[in-house]
């Protein structure tokens, strides 16, 4: 790799997850250099025959880029000088999951760090009152998940209660034949209570809350990536 420095420099990565079909970021920072032309960034993926991305002398150098990444990668060129080597990955694929290496060469030396990149699908759930049902029923829907998640209902009033006997969850494959729509129905709902629909797989955990009173309905959703320091 034509090493320009003798010393080791600090390179820092952050494990992250990509949502398939969307754009993702592989985070990497390093001790900055004063000259852009002295900085080389190489992104590699374990077990891949070509490079993921290379940036040197102030521009992309993609002659040895692996075909699986062609047209899908970019660094933040204007931020390289301040030590940002993060990679933007367009249209994340399930097969992009794996171990990546961010390899940096500057006039100060060289360094590298690995990161685990998980891929899947995750989306925010929405909880609504199902007025079509014969009894008071809540319907929790999330459009895109992969791998298949677990769904658990909880309630503020009946903390610790097991709602598996009074709920029904289904998974419907989406048109691209990878991700699935999650639908969970909770029966025998009482008013003046807050219910939570929690959807979780090994990549993300999402919660949809609904507070049902006689006068109003309040909703709130939250999504958190797992095994990621981001």
């Amino acid at each position: 790799f034509g090493i320009s420095g003798r010393h080791s420099i600090t390179v820092t990565t952050v494990a992250s997850a990509g949502n398939i079909g969307e754009d993702g970021i592989l985070s990497c920072t390093f001790e900055p250099d004063i000259k852009l032309s002295d900085i080389v960034i190489q992104w590699l993926k374990e077990g891949v025959l070509g490079l993921v991305h290379e940036f040197k002398e102030g521009k992309d150098e993609l002659s040895e880029q692996d075909e699986m990444f062609r047209g899908r990668t970019a660094v933040f060129a204007d931020q390289v000088i301040v030590g940002n080597a993060s990679l933007r990955l367009k249209n994340v694929q399930l097969t992009d999951a794996g171990t990546y290496k961010c390899y940096i060469i500057t006039s100060k030396g060289k360094g590298n760090a690995n990161l685990e990149y998980k891929t899947g699908a995750f989306s925010m759930p929405e909880v609504n009152v199902d007025y079509n049902a014969s009894s008071e029923t809540l319907r929790c829907e999330a459009p895109r998940w992969f791998p298949q998640p677990t769904v658990v209902w909880a309630s503020q009033v009946d903390q610790g209660a097991n709602f598996s006997e009074v709920s029904n969850t289904s998974f419907e494959l989406n048109s691209e034949n990878v991700t699935m729509k999650v639908v969970s129905v909770l029966y025998n709902v009482t008013i003046n209570n807050t219910y939570s629909c929690m959807i979780e797989n090994d990549i993300a955990k999402a919660t949809g809350d609904i507070k049902v009173t006689e006068s109003e309905i309040k909703r709130r959703s939250h999504l958190q990536l797992l095994n990621s320091k981001a």
Epitope: G47, D66, E67, M68, G98
Partner: antibody, heavy 122, light 107 residues
Framework: EVQLLESGGGLVQPGGSLRLSCAAS????????MSWVRQAPGKGLEWVSA????????YYADSVKGRFTISRDNSKNTLYLQMNSLRAEDTAVYYC???????????????WGQGTLVTVSS | DIQMTQSPSSLSASVGDRVTITCRAS??????LAWFQQKPGKAPKLLIY???SLEGGVPSRFSGSGSGTDFTLTISSLQPEDFATYYC?????????FGQGTKVEIK
Amino acid sequence: EVQLLESGGGLVQPGGSLRLSCAASGFTFSSYAMSWVRQAPGKGLEWVSAISGGGGSTYYADSVKGRFTISRDNSKNTLYLQMNSLRAEDTAVYYCARDIQWFGESTLFDYWGQGTLVTVSS
Amino acid sequence: DIQMTQSPSSLSASVGDRVTITCRASQSIRSWLAWFQQKPGKAPKLLIYKASSLEGGVPSRFSGSGSGTDFTLTISSLQPEDFATYYCQQYNSYSRTFGQGTKVEIK
């Protein structure tokens, strides 16, 4: 100890199909790309195909493109080569070999199987 | 596709001789070149990778040099066990190509 063991070779008629397998052990299989290399009787080595560690990328020599399909099952530590529309010139000993782990940083083709003979003849 | 041309295709040498085999790529492959040794009925054995890096366990009499398009494998003092066929292989990005081989025979 790293071991690669090919199987599935044999005699097949022109136009026929065959599926080769390569069982790997002694290393983290999913961390490495894997390749198939063949050698016709009395001839040199010819790289046939490769597949990335996760299976997301496949690569082929022009001579087999559209006829051969490489795949892997990381849960079984096994590499495959599905060979269709076989021709007499495909007759060779087929080797599986451990390919690269990190581009530019690691050795490649450092471990080979013992080979399996494929004969295409009527 | 990148073509690899090896020369000579065969050579006769004696034990103790210095042997040089050359390999030329049809376009620059930087240092992405490996050398293999193969004996009859056996699988090839990796000797050199990245043009000049000696694989573990390979005797130091084997050495490789070159970059870009021109590469050399040198055996400094030929030993009886070195009589075999030698292949170069390029691994530039996602293609791999072998040279046609050089057979080293006993004079």
